[in-house]
Amino acid sequence: GITIPRNPGCPNSEDKNFPRTVMVNLNIHNRNTNTNPKRSSDYYNRSTSPWNLHRNEDPERYPSVIWEAKCRHLGCINADGNVDYHMNSVPIQQEILVLRREPPHCPNSFRLEKILVSVGCTCVTPIVHHVA
Amino acid sequence: GITIPRNPGCPNSEDKNFPRTVMVNLNIHNRNTNTNPKRSSDYYNRSTSPWNLHRNEDPERYPSVIWEAKCRHLGCINADGNVDYHMNSVPIQQEILVLRREPPHCPNSFRLEKILVSVGCTCVTPIVHHVA
């Protein structure tokens, strides 16, 4: 891996398990200043593999609310606006990091957790073709 | 919001800015044990809006490596395998949380950061139509 020179101004760790347990500032810095959120917000409706977004809430997790995509159709929308079952609408999944309260119900102690979320859907050619 | 009853076994916080700064255990718990990663790994190739994945590495970030999707074509692949420019391949973007070393180069001190990543591509009808 890449070796990072240590900054002499780093906080000291009093944790015996260091670097397993670290300090994290929850004041979120948002790097997404150069994007126009309205531009991509309607892809779920305009896609040939449209999807609905479902709210997943868990107070023991940070962020507590995550939106999950669920494809509207098994097939894809064709040029006539009909569902074409020769193609498949499938969810695009991504592994993301969240913070899980540990021990449970603790406001200032967390553990990193990897979860898989469906972000949207795409239209794919079927992996198995039936031959008559 | 939902009020969480505090667990009496929670660690004490010695930080004056509590709950801004919290303790996080970096031993990642993976909740994705019931998924088959190979199942979705070829969607990028089979989609009508196929994409390539580009490695984005930043040693000051955790995770240090993030994969960014870039659509292969401006249009979408039609039934004949050709690019149809009446439709658009667009990236599906998601806001994710990462940890940013703060102060820089510190191994045990981080700040939460929101970044936008392109996860894959979907085929959409154009947002602005030209009228002849």
Partner: nanobody, 124 residues
């Protein structure tokens, strides 16, 4: 009526210059990112340059960096592509379309339909 109309193409000698215009009607360009794209005979359409809707950031394909400049005039609802030091390999039909720059900055994608385009031919 919503339209994007390209103009300014023509025949030019290698080393020469052209200025392409993309005029919008029926909607305001300042809300949208706009890109210039080109398609040479027998080749796939490719991104040349884009300008972002949000912060005015720009993208240029490696093949045109330092030679082409994209700009926008919101008052005239027009986006321009100034092309200098033209080469024979720049010969193509040039299109403008509603577009946005990838988060990584390495390219742009289209989120709109295409106009008729304008032919640029670089030949001696």
């Amino acid at each position: 009526e919503v339209r994007l109309v390209e103009s300014g193409g023509g025949l030019v000698q290698p080393g020469g210059s052209l200025r392409l215009s993309c005029a919008a009607s029926g909607f305001t360009l300042d809300y949208y990112g706009i890109g210039w794209f080109r398609q040479a005979p027998g080749k796939e359409r490719e991104g040349v340059s884009c300008i972002s809707s949000s912060d005015g950031s720009t993208y240029y394909a490696d093949s045109v960096k330092g030679r082409f400049t994209i700009s926008r005039d919101n008052a005239k609802n027009t986006v321009y592509l100034q092309m200098n030091s033209l080469k024979p390999e720049d010969t193509a039909v040039y299109y403008c379309a509603v577009a946005e720059i990838y988060l990584s900055g390495y390219g742009c994608y289209v989120d709109g339909s295409w106009g008729q385009g304008t032919q640029v031919t670089v030949s001696s």
